[in-house]
Structures are given as structure tokens and as C-alpha cells.
């Protein structure tokens, strides 16, 4: 009788992560008597995948009933495949021996390749905000995909970016891979509503790429422009001075009025108006009692925006033209805070 052969008809099998892999194996004879075992890899470090008589293999089922007397089909199914299962699987026939069974013949092996989808790309921007005209870096990461081939693109508001660097790790063979890309983006004053998108295309995604986004509103700081103007006299001895704070982002802003360098009032921007580009405008006004001043008054509008160093704008108020009112000691009325917005 011809010597037993172990036949693994499939040189390779390709399975998607999460699915079941079928590894086929048949023997050409019932002799010698002894069990079949499945291993991943060869040599002393090989991993036991299935032993028909002993051990716990909850993910493995046999295709046929191995207890049938003349069974020669030793194919197995491995459920819930992950990239870690990739490798070459060997169907090995043992013959009964003492004390241990002895390896008799091995199949040629079946290479199991696992296709695994990349994780949703995660886009992260710089830790600190930056102002228009500055270049900032965004990173995009996606993990756990196989095979290694992958395409990554960057977009800003639908326009493809070209200034980026991408790495796929590891460089050598692995059960799964990760991609890391860094893109450089130049900020403009109009970027409050802008989005940066990282797009990943992979064979497992069937032409429907995965996208990760970052809103530039989290990254940009648009500093305000200030304008201080003197309004027509409201009443005798009173002058209304306004400070227009325009085109700032984010909203966090504190304004201080100074009269001749002395703090008169501090307020926080609350009821702001939003511009079409996502920036904000705000206005504060100060009612100055000119009769309380003998000399000209220097009024300063000082703004601290988003924790940055203060910027200021001054206005010189001439008081010589106004008659002096005796006995008045109030330089400014603190009720002069106005949260209406005037353009």
C-alpha cells in the first residue's frame, strides 16, 4: 500500500477579519493509526492550533466528524479571524507512539492572509492656538489594517493639500499595520469655519474611504481690531466714547477702560454678534463726565483676547471747550456699560 500523504490543496487563503477561515486537509490513507494536529508555523516554536483528542480550542471546529472510522478529511474552520491569525498553517499526521505520539507526515502548508479594515482616522491639531498666516501641523492616525498597501489624502475645505508626510509602520512583515501622517496648513482669517480632512482608502473599504476631520475653529485665533471713537455729546458735560472690537475669535475677551492710565471699568464680552466668517464683533462704551476733568483726558480701550497680551487703542478727549462744573468728583459713570452692538 502507498505511504500516507497529507494533502493541503490550498496554498493560500484570504479571509476578512471577523470571518471564518476554512483550512482544508485530507489524508490519503488510514494507516498509520494516529491523530491529526494543526500547527501555525514550523519548527520548535510552532503554535498548536488544533488537536483532535486533547486540549481546548474554542474557535476551531472540524468540517467532518473525525470519529468516523474511515474519515480522511481533517479540514478545520477557525472562527472570528483577526490579523494576529495570519501565518502558515500545517496539517500534521502523527502515529501512535510511547510515551508520546510521533510526527509522521506534514502537509505543505496553507498561508492564511487576513484582510483587516483600518480604524477610523483620528485627526489632531496643535496643542495651542495659532493666528492667521502661521503654519500649523495636523496629524492623522489609523491602525490595525492589513494588507499594508494604503492611500492617505489631506483636504482643507474640499481642496487637496500637498504639504504632508506619511509613514506606514512597521516597515517589515506584520500581522497588521498603522499609518501616521502630518500635514502643514497655513491659516487665514477666514478659517474659523474651515475643516481639515484626512481620508484613508484601503482594499477592505470597497471604494468607500474613511475620513477623520478637525475643525480649524479649535486651532485658530483671530486677534481683534480696535477702534475708539467719540460720539456726539449726549448731555451737557457728558461725552460717550465707544470701543469697537471687531473680527475676533474665539469669543473669550476682556475689555478694560482706562482714564489717564487709571482703570475705570473692566468687562467681559458677553452678547457678541457673529460675522459670516465665524468671527465676532463687540462694542463697549464709556460715558465720561468732562466737568470732572480740568485737563484733557486720555481714554484707553485695552483688550485681552483669549489669554494673549493685551492690545489697546487710545483716544484724547479735549475738555478745554467745556465749562468746568464745580464739586463734581465722578470721572466716569460705571453704569455706562452697554452691551448693544453698534456698527
Amino acid at each position: 500500500e502507498e505511504e500516507l500523504q497529507v494533502i493541503q490543496p490550498d496554498k493560500s487563503v484570504l479571509v476578512a477579519a471577523g470571518e471564518t477561515a476554512t483550512l482544508r486537509c485530507t489524508a490519503t490513507s488510514l494507516i498509520p493509526v494516529g491523530p491529526i494536529q494543526w500547527f501555525r508555523g514550523a519548527g520548535p516554536g510552532r503554535e498548536l492550533i488544533y488537536n483532535q483528542k486533547e486540549g481546548h480550542f474554542p474557535r476551531v471546529t472540524t468540517v467532518s466528524d473525525l470519529t468516523k472510522r474511515n474519515n480522511m478529511d481533517f479540514s478545520i474552520r477557525i472562527g472570528n479571524i483577526t490579523p494576529a491569525d495570519a501565518g502558515t498553517y500545517y496539517c500534521v499526521k502523527f502515529r501512535k507512539g510511547s510515551p508520546d505520539d510521533v510526527e509522521f507526515k506534514s502537509g505543505a502548508g496553507t498561508e492564511l492572509s487576513v484582510r483587516a479594515k483600518p480604524s477610523a482616522p483620528v485627526v489632531s491639531g496643535p496643542a495651542a492656538r495659532a493666528t492667521p498666516q502661521h503654519t500649523v501641523s495636523f496629524t492623522c492616525e489609523s491602525h490595525g489594517f492589513s494588507p499594508r498597501d494604503i492611500t492617505l489624502k489631506w483636504f482643507k475645505n474640499g481642496n487637496e493639500l500637498s504639504d504632508f508626510q506619511t509613514n506606514v509602520d512597521p516597515v517589515g512583515e506584520s500581522v497588521s499595520y498603522s499609518i501616521h501622517s502630518t500635514a502643514k496648513v497655513v491659516l487665514t482669517r477666514e478659517d474659523v469655519h474651515s475643516q481639515v480632512i484626512c481620508e484613508v482608502a484601503h482594499v477592505t473599504l470597497q471604494g468607500d474611504p474613511l475620513r477623520g476631520t478637525a475643525n480649524l475653529s479649535e486651532t485658530i485665533r483671530v486677534p481683534p481690531t480696535l477702534e475708539v471713537t467719540q460720539q456726539p455729546v449726549r448731555a451737557e458735560n457728558q461725552v460717550n466714547v465707544t470701543c469697537q472690537v471687531r473680527k475676533f475669535y474665539p469669543q473669550r475677551l476682556q475689555l478694560t477702560w482706562l482714564e489717564n492710565g487709571n482703570v475705570s471699568r473692566t468687562e467681559t464680552a458677553s452678547t457678541v454678534t457673529e460675522n459670516k466668517d465665524g468671527t465676532y464683533n463687540w462694542m463697549s462704551w464709556l460715558l465720561v463726565n468732562v466737568s470732572a476733568h480740568r485737563d484733557d483726558v486720555k481714554l484707553t480701550c485695552q483688550v485681552e483676547h483669549d489669554g494673549q497680551p493685551a492690545v489697546s487703542k487710545s483716544h484724547d478727549l479735549k475738555v478745554s471747550a467745556h465749562p468746568k462744573e464745580q464739586g463734581s468728583n465722578t470721572a466716569a459713570e460705571n453704569t455706562g456699560s452697554n452691551e448693544r452692538n453698534i456698527y
Partner: antibody, heavy 114, light 108 residues
Framework: QVQLVQSGAEVKKPGASVKVSCKAS????????MHWVRQAPGQGLEWMGR????????KYNPKFQDRVTMTRDTSTSTVYMELSSLRSEDTAVYYC???????WGQGTTVTVSS | EIVLTQSPGTLSLSPGERATLSCRAS???????LYWYQQKPGQAPRLLIY???NLASGIPDRFSGSGSGTDFTLTISRLEPEDFAVYYC?????????FGGGTKVEIK
């Protein structure tokens, strides 16, 4: 569900033999080996041997080679472990376990005393 | 035969603490053939970990296994009251199959 039901407690005199049974249900009896493991009072686990229910093939721990016999009855899906020439040190709980090491019998207490 | 030596023999710990149990083999054991069991008084052993590091069905993930060659470890990250028991390592790499002497994890 998988069950391994063992025979009841036994009290034996030194020099006698004891035969413990283990009836399997809920799975294909010939699928995997059946092992016998014992545990003396306050001691650890000790592997005695195994039988292949498909063909009766056995492997014994050399320590028990001369005194243990494992058999099976496929018609009743039952395996047996017989231990002869009993001595006081054989007082233990005897377990049968399926080849997957997940399913164990409830244990059979064998007391050897004169 | 492959002798499995477990240490320590007894581990006295409080609930919430981390337990690290060692199993050393007298000769190399392939990772696929190293199992761990938990046993409570009057009960049969219960399979905890198979193939060195895989959790058996229904075993909480505070249990983990690691190791290779001759050194294997069972770790319980945060002891729960029901974890106080005796733990055994076991090899079925070669005949005769053998068990370690056991480590008793007791309440401090």
C-alpha cells in the same frame, strides 16, 4: 449540556481494588480523550492517565502503571478507572476530565482504611 | 517527566490587590500546552487560562496569563472576594501530564 457523572464514594481496605465510573453525556463520547486526575486530602492534583474512548488506547502515569487500568464502554458512554493494591496513600478524590480540560466530573471520594 | 514548580506556596493578600503567581517548568514547554486552573474547597478544578494566555469562557478579564519556555505567570489584577482559592498550572506537552503543586491565595 456536557455532563460527566461519577459513581459514588467508596471505602476500601488496604490491598483491595476500586473501580470508579464516569458517564458522559452532551457530546460525542469518542471525540476526545478522557483523563483521570486524583487529589489526596489537602494535596495537589495528580494526573493518573487517559483513555481514548474511540479505540481504548491508554497512556498511564508511570507511578500508577502497574496498578491502574482504564477502560471504556461505548454503548453507555462510560469510562472506568480501576486501581488495585490499594494503600492508605490512595485515599483521595478521583476526578474524570474530558480531553478539553473544561469539563470535569464531580469527583469520587475513595477512602482506604483498615 | 516535566516537573512544574509553583511559587509562592501561599499568597496572603487583601481584596483589590494584585496577585502574581509563578509556574516554573523543569524543561521547556510550548506555550500552547500550558493551562491554569482555579479550585475552591469541595469543587472540581475550573479551567481559567489555556495556551498560556487565553481566557477560558466566562473568566473575567482581571485574570491574565503570560510566559514562555520554562517560566509562566498567572496575574490577577485586582483580587475580588471570590478569587481566594488554590491555583494550579498544568502541562500536557509531554507524558506524563503534570500539575504544579498549587498556590493558595488567601485573605490577609
Amino acid at each position: 449540556q456536557v455532563q460527566l457523572v461519577q459513581s459514588g464514594a467508596e471505602v476500601k481496605k488496604p490491598g483491595a481494588s476500586v473501580k470508579v465510573s464516569c458517564k458522559a453525556s452532551g457530546f460525542n463520547f469518542e471525540d476526545t480523550y478522557m483523563h483521570w486526575v486524583r487529589q489526596a486530602p489537602g494535596q495537589g492534583l495528580e494526573w493518573m492517565g487517559r483513555i481514548d474512548p474511540a479505540d481504548g488506547d491508554t497512556k498511564y502515569n508511570p507511578k500508577f502503571q502497574d496498578r491502574v487500568t482504564m477502560t471504556r464502554d461505548t454503548s453507555t458512554s462510560t469510562v472506568y478507572m480501576e486501581l488495585s493494591s490499594l494503600r492508605s496513600e490512595d485515599t483521595a478524590v478521583y476526578y474524570c476530565a474530558r480531553g478539553n480540560y473544561v469539563n470535569w466530573g464531580q469527583g469520587t471520594t475513595v477512602t482506604v482504611s483498615s | 517527566e516535566i516537573v512544574l514548580t509553583q511559587s509562592p506556596g501561599t499568597l496572603s493578600l487583601s481584596p483589590g490587590e494584585r496577585a502574581t503567581l509563578s509556574c516554573r517548568a523543569s524543561s521547556s514547554v510550548s506555550s500552547s500546552y500550558l493551562y491554569w486552573y482555579q479550585q475552591k474547597p469541595g469543587q472540581a478544578p475550573r479551567l481559567l487560562i489555556y495556551s498560556t494566555s487565553n481566557l477560558a469562557s466566562g473568566i473575567p478579564d482581571r485574570f491574565s496569563g503570560s510566559g514562555s519556555g520554562t517560566d509562566f505567570t498567572l496575574t490577577i489584577s485586582r483580587l475580588e472576594p471570590e478569587d481566594f482559592a488554590v491555583y494550579y498550572c498544568h502541562q500536557w506537552y509531554s507524558y506524563p501530564r503534570t500539575f504544579g503543586g498549587g498556590t493558595k491565595v488567601e485573605i490577609k
